[in-house]
Structure formats: structure tokens, C-alpha cells
């Protein structure tokens, strides 16, 4: 039985050219996290494996940095980065948990700073 829940940053916004941290947290389960996959819509961005460490997809290497923790840092943001991001937690013995984050990249300097995991 899957008892865990994923807490995410939810809907966040950031300025064009800036950086943002995407963060998820799995709670309410004792399952072992074996791997976390980060996806942007239909693209695999990065994987953090408990044994192998991080793999960043080559096409995103210049703008994606691992961490902090199991999170992902997006750099040099463009308006094309606006969209849905997913953290996919592979756990044993529970199975897979998925969290969703919506990022809006704004042209102006009025990006909100309210999101809990966002870079101030």
C-alpha cells in the first residue's frame, strides 16, 4: 500500500535570465528512494540514482545543475522554460510517486517570491 505523499513547490514564477530551484519532498512513507527522475513535459532532464549519483541529459547540461539534495536548479531561464515539471520518485517497495510543479518565466521583474523553495 502506498502511503507516501509528495510535497512540491507548486506553482512558481521566476524572471527571465534568472535561476530557480525545483524541489520535491516525499513524506509519510518508510519506502527507500532508489531514484528520482526530473522531467519537463515530454523531456527527461535529469536523474538522481541512489547508487550512481546524478545524470544530467546532455542537451540540458549547460542550464541544469543537480541539487540541492534531490532537487534541480534551472539556470539562464527563458520564456520557453515555462511549463510543467515532474519529479518522479522511484521507491522500494512502494513503487512510483509523482509530483508536479508549474513554472512561469516572466519577462518583467515582478516575479513572485512566495514559493517556499524558490531562490530569493
Amino acid at each position: 500500500m502506498m502511503t507516501g505523499t509528495i510535497e512540491t513547490t507548486g506553482n512558481i514564477s521566476a524572471e527571465k535570465g534568472g535561476s530557480i530551484i525545483l524541489q520535491c519532498h516525499l513524506s509519510s512513507t518508510t519506502a527507500q528512494v532508489t531514484q528520482v527522475n526530473w522531467e519537463q513535459q515530454d523531456q527527461l532532464l535529469a536523474i538522481c540514482n541512489a547508487d550512481l549519483g546524478w545524470h544530467i541529459s546532455p542537451s540540458f547540461k549547460d542550464r541544469v545543475a543537480p541539487g540541492p539534495g534531490l532537487g534541480l536548479t534551472l539556470q539562464s531561464l527563458t520564456v520557453n522554460d515555462t511549463g510543467e515539471y515532474f519529479c518522479i520518485y522511484h521507491t522500494y517497495p512502494d513503487g512510483t510517486y509523482t509530483g508536479r510543479i508549474f513554472l512561469e518565466v516572466l519577462e518583467s521583474s515582478v516575479a513572485e517570491h512566495g514559493a517556499r523553495f524558490q531562490i530569493p
Epitope: 527507500q32 532508489t34 531514484q35 522531467e39 515530454d42 523531456q43 527527461l44 536523474i47 540514482n49 541512489a50 547508487d51 550512481l52 545524470h55 541529459s57 542537451s59 522511484h90 522500494y92 517497495p93
Partner: antibody, heavy 118, light 107 residues
Framework: EVQLLESGGGLVQPGGSLRLSCAAS????????MHWVRQAPGKGLEWVAS????????SYADSVKGRFTISRDNSKNTLYLQMNSLRAEDTAVYYC???????????WGQGTLVTVSS | DIQMTQSPSSLSASVGDRVTITCRAS??????LNWYQQKPGKAPKLLIY???SLQSGVPSRFSGSGSGTDFTLTISSLQPEDFATYYC?????????FGGGTKVEIK
């Protein structure tokens, strides 16, 4: 250098059993998921089974579920496939493959031929 | 199970030709799509992983693209050693499934 070497193939009668081995070297075996893939003569590739590195949790193709068992001995850097109740349609070359991040099969063994025939 | 449909099943081409092979998944698989090359009597060899990432040591004439359900393997300029059979494979969910293969033959 990463190397995977399968062994244990051969001729077996229908209903018989066989155990395949895959000896791994050149990498930290326990960190990687490992898979078995087979290829019937003149046919395409068919995934058979997988086993994770850290938890040894396993998955099987429906065609072999209940008959085949995948296992590993991380102390011996060896992957196994126990095949029971073999059928003619199990005749194939069996490959073991290393699967980093459970996504791609980056190294394959040379394969071992299993022939099920009376 | 996710079905992988590869096309064409075979093609004839000449050295220097640009070759395109397509693979379609029966449901969205994000970018969990890999491409392999196999020569007769040999084990498959990984060319492209995660739809578009070139495996280390693979010539840059090979490239992959696509996401969701439609994917493409392109060989920009076919070389003599590229005549082989090519397979796509999804790793989005088990059971893992392969396409039926595309045999690239000499014209």
C-alpha cells in the same frame, strides 16, 4: 573495461530446466540494474526480465512469468536466469545487459544460445 | 503493454545517403526511447538513449529526436559499417518493449 560474459546455454528438452549466468567485470556490479533480453532465430529483440541493483526487486515479461527467475549475487558479480518448464518458443540467444538509471542498456554480453527441442 | 511500431521494416540505401527511421509508441513514453544497432551474429549496441542523447563513442552522424509518441533515428551520411538492423526500445514502463527492427541494406 566493462565486460559481460554469458554462459549456461545449450540443448534442453521441452519441460526441462537450465540456468544461465552472466559474469560481470569492470564496473561496480551492485550499483546497476541488470536485464535479460532474448532473440529467437531470425527474429527481433524481446525483453525477458530485470533486477535492480540495490533492492534486487525484479520484473518479468508475461511470456516467462512463473517459469523464469532472475537473481544476482553481488559478491560474485554474477547475474542469473533460472529457466524452468522450457518450451520450444523459448529457443533464442539470451543476452544480459547493464542498465544504468533503469533507462538504457549500455553494455551487452555476447549472448548464449538456448535450444529447446526433443 | 506499450507497443512500439518501427518503419520501414527494411530499406535500401547507398553510402553517403541520409537515412531516417521512425518509431511510434502506442502511448506517450516521454523521452524514454533508446536506439540500438545490431549486426549479424553480434550483440546489440546502444546508439542513442533518452530519445536524443548520443552514447559515448558513437559517431556524430547518428542522431535521435522526438518525444511523446513519435521518434526518429537519423544517419546523416550512411557509411559502409552502418549496414545493420536498428531497433527502438521504450523504457517508460515494464514490460520493456522493442520495435520490430529496420534492416538497412546496400542498394
Amino acid at each position: 573495461e566493462v565486460q559481460l560474459l554469458e554462459s549456461g546455454g545449450g540443448l534442453v528438452q521441452p519441460g526441462g530446466s537450465l540456468r544461465l549466468s552472466c559474469a560481470a567485470s569492470g564496473f561496480t556490479f551492485s550499483s546497476y540494474s541488470m536485464h535479460w533480453v532474448r532473440q529467437a532465430p531470425g527474429k527481433g529483440l524481446e525483453w525477458v526480465a530485470s533486477i535492480s541493483g540495490s533492492t534486487s526487486s525484479s520484473s518479468y515479461a508475461d511470456s516467462v512469468k512463473g517459469r523464469f527467475t532472475i537473481s544476482r549475487d553481488n559478491s560474485k558479480n554474477t547475474l542469473y536466469l533460472q529457466m524452468n518448464s522450457l518450451r520450444a518458443e523459448d529457443t533464442a540467444v539470451y543476452y544480459c545487459a547493464r542498465v544504468p538509471y533503469d533507462v538504457w542498456m549500455d553494455y551487452w554480453g555476447q549472448g548464449t544460445l538456448v535450444t529447446v527441442s526433443s | 503493454d506499450i507497443q512500439m511500431t518501427q518503419s520501414p521494416s527494411s530499406l535500401s540505401a547507398s553510402v553517403g545517403d541520409r537515412v531516417t527511421i521512425t518509431c511510434r509508441a502506442s502511448q506517450s513514453i516521454s523521452s524514454y526511447l533508446n536506439w540500438y544497432q545490431q549486426k549479424p551474429g553480434k550483440a546489440p549496441k546502444l546508439l542513442i538513449y533518452a530519445a536524443s542523447s548520443l552514447q559515448s563513442g558513437v559517431p556524430s552522424r547518428f542522431s535521435g529526436s522526438g518525444s511523446g509518441t513519435d521518434f526518429t533515428l537519423t544517419i546523416s551520411s550512411l557509411q559502409p559499417e552502418d549496414f545493420a538492423t536498428y531497433y527502438c526500445q521504450q523504457s517508460y514502463s515494464t514490460p520493456l518493449t522493442f520495435g520490430g527492427g529496420t534492416k538497412v541494406e546496400i542498394k
